[in-house]
């Protein structure tokens, strides 16, 4: 087999709700023909399942083969470098990939103008890959919370707020002129999952009309 290939230095998952991506760092001095083999182990079924024989990218979408993540004990993944007939030792993820590793996001934040106030609606994620019964609110059925950041123009500051426990909120804005921009970061009080700030959604108030911008 000649000289042994070095193993990928690190392998890890980066996941959002039903978007489970395995990443790895390349081996040093890889050639144009170097590719990577990916295998997956489901806890409770103690055998490795080959997922990809030769990926030339440094990530692999494992969502389709980990759809039961939210009802399972989790997964481990491993990756090795392959170059022709040579291959490296496996590098295994350091931690169990479970629901705890999923970064929480919101689908979007909708802002609507009403008589004297802005109504904000937090839309929960609705990934296409998710099975019909596996909604965000069914999996995280209790203790959903949201940190809300509001920025006003004119003005120099962004104001963050204590976590709120509802998906709807109101901003009292009668007579206001300017732009209000909102971001939301979800969490679940009973869990340790990280949350990610949403894209900023803005609404402009004038005396005559309003516009929504991203």
């Amino acid at each position: 087999h000649g000289t042994e290939l070095p193993s990928p230095p690190s392998v890890w998952f980066e996941a959002e709700f039903f978007h489970h991506i395995l990443h790895w760092t390349p081996i040093p001095n890889q050639s144009e023909s170097t590719c990577y083999e990916v295998a997956l182990l489901r806890y409770g079924i103690e055998s490795w399942n080959s997922i990809s024989n030769c990926s030339q990218t440094l990530s692999y979408d494992l969502t389709a083969v980990t759809l039961d993540l939210y009802h399972s004990n989790g997964y481990r993944a491993r990756v090795r470098a392959v170059d022709g007939s040579r291959h490296s030792n496996w590098t295994v993820t350091n931690t169990r990939f479970s629901v705890d590793e999923v970064t929480l996001t919101v689908g979007s934040v909708n802002l609507e103008i009403h008589n004297g106030f802005i109504l904000g609606k937090i839309q929960l994620p609705r990934p296409k890959m998710a099975p019909a019964n596996d909604t965000y609110e069914s999996i995280f059925s209790h203790f959903r919370e949201y940190e809300i950041a509001i920025r006003k123009v004119p003005g120099n500051f962004t104001f963050t707020h204590k976590k709120v426990k509802h998906e709807n909120f109101s901003l009292l804005t009668s007579g206001e002129v300017g732009e209000f921009c909102v971001q939301v970061k979800p969490s679940v009080a009973s869990r340790s999952n990280k949350g990610m700030w949403s894209k900023e959604e803005c609404i402009s108030l004038t005396r005559q009309y309003f516009t929504v911008t991203n």
Epitope: G116, F117, I118, I148, I150, R151, K152, P154, G155, F157, T158, F159, T160, H161, K162, V164, K165, H166, N168, F169, S170, L171, L172, T173, S174, G175, E176, V177, F180
Partner: nanobody
Amino acid sequence: DVQLVESGGGLVQPGGSLRLSCAASDFTLDYYAIGWFRQAPGKEREGVSCISSSGGSTYYADSVKGRFTISRDNAKNTVSLQMNSLKPEDTAVYYCAADAACMVVAGTLILPDDYWGQGTQVTVSS
């Protein structure tokens, strides 16, 4: 840095009145909503009242409606809370806080994380 300073607290008999003021140094209040919050001993901080930067929107907690009035004087860079018909249960430390807008969730005024004053004590007792 934003510095908010409350004043006007004190000891008052039930049924009496107090006027609290919130002033800012090195910070123009007129761009921002100002909320009044209070914290009684052993209780969580709760929203009392809020006024939008334009003064066109106000919020009052059910417990103070008809008794408290919030107003702002942007020329003097102050926001005031006139408190009438005070009750013993109004006893608390009162804080003002700056916000981009008065935010209400399920009928409750939501506390901002930053830009708070140090508080002024209000005691209602005979």
